[in-house]
């Protein structure tokens, strides 16, 4: 396993609709044709696997149908969007990139993006 640098923003604020987007950029040491991107979430002692996608260079990222993630790729950049976020989902979201093929296998793990999610205040009832 060889190390690879992965960069991602330090902080992102989710929209009022619970959507957060950030770019995950990796320094590819070679000409990878198959790349796997994983989003992990760390909150206190809990580390969970949020979503993952494997893609062939030049093709779109494909997440599972019921995944909360979507994304697009462009060169060595992956644009990730996580939706359906609530305040309780606030945490450090780590981008993990693996160059699966051809060998050698490279692994890169970003320092994480702190995503802050604020639940919108319910609209007060109005009488006219």
């Amino acid at each position: 396993c060889k190390a690879m640098h992965v960069a991602q923003p330090a902080v992102v604020l989710a929209s009022s609709r619970g959507i957060a987007s950030f770019v995950c950029e990796y320094a590819s040491p070679g000409k990878a044709t198959e790349v796997r991107v994983t989003v992990l979430r760390q909150a206190d002692s809990q580390v969970t696997e949020v979503c993952a996608a494997t893609y062939m260079m030049g093709n779109e990222l494909t997440f599972l149908d019921d995944s909360i993630c979507t994304g697009t790729s462009s060169g060595n950049q992956v644009n990730l969007t996580i939706q359906g976020l609530r305040a309780m989902d606030t945490g450090l979201y780590i981008c993990k990139v693996e160059l699966m093929y051809p060998p050698p296998y490279y692994l890169g793990i970003g320092n994480g993006t702190q995503i802050y999610v604020i639940d919108p205040e319910p609209c007060p009832d109005s009488d006219f």
Epitope: T38, L40, Q42, D44, S45, Q46, V47, T48, E49, V50, C51, A52, L64, D66, S67, I94, K96, E98, L107, I109
Partner: antibody, heavy 120, light 106 residues
């Protein structure tokens, strides 16, 4: 070399508590969570909980209904698992375990296990 | 909690023959991780992140799957492969293991 060395076997009476230790070496103790897993005779593996030694934050499996307490002593690089109100169903081998790399290679390192017997 | 069901419960395989173990999760998981547990020993990591071989594990072992259905395959079983195999998820807490599959050699 990463090593997790656990305390020896324990025999306890029903209703008592047991405290199992797991001494870590070969890495920076505060860099990794320590998880605890148990296996009862004839049963599968059960995740009990984990602790982040750096922040001392913990996460527990509610299956153990608040009977488990995880602590860590950073000065000695030792993690502890205490289980209270022991009953016959708690007879098991208890393991501490650590990930191989941060955010990768989950549960790559394991302690040798500690057998806890509950008997009156 | 995510419940993980393994099939078969046990299997008996002759050396040199292939073996396959399935793990079905009650809801979709990102990855599956596989362990082997031998009597008197600590569990050993075999495959993590569905398909990545753990350090020191021979390439006779392979993992695949996505969503709720995952598979561990051994292309040619050897005597040392005997033990109980477990799948595990860490998509949501509490972390859960599969019910276990006992592999015996004929």
């Amino acid at each position: 070399e990463v090593q997790l060395v656990q305390s020896g076997a324990e025999v306890k009476k029903p209703g008592a508590s047991v405290k199992v230790s797991c001494k870590a070496s070969g890495y920076t103790f505060t860099d990794y969570n320590m998880d605890w897993v148990r296996q009862a005779p004839g049963a599968g593996l059960d995740w009990m909980g984990n602790i982040n030694p750096n922040s001392e934050s913990t996460s527990y499996n509610q299956k153990f209904k608040g009977r488990v307490t995880l602590t860590a002593d950073t000065s000695t690089s030792t993690a502890y698992m205490e289980l209270s109100s022991l009953r016959a169903g708690d007879i098991a081998v208890y393991y501490c375990t650590r990930d191989g790399n941060r955010y990768d290679a989950w549960f790559a390192y394991w302690g040798q296990g500690t057998l806890v017997t509950v008997s009156s | 909690d995510i419940v993980m069901t393994q099939t078969p419960l046990s299997l008996s395989v002759s050396p040199g023959e292939p073996a396959s173990i399935s793990c079905s999760a009650s809801s979709s998981v990102t990855y599956m991780h596989w362990f082997r547990h031998k009597p008197g020993q600590s569990p050993q990591s075999l495959i993590y992140s569905t398909s990545i071989l753990a350090s020191g594990v021979p390439d006779r072992f392979s993992g695949s799957g996505s969503g709720t259905d995952f598979t561990l395959k051994i292309s040619r079983v050897e005597a040392d492969d005997a033990g109980v195999y477990y799948c595990q998820q860490r998509t949501s807490y509490p972390l859960t293991f599969g019910t276990g599959t006992k592999l015996e050699l004929k």
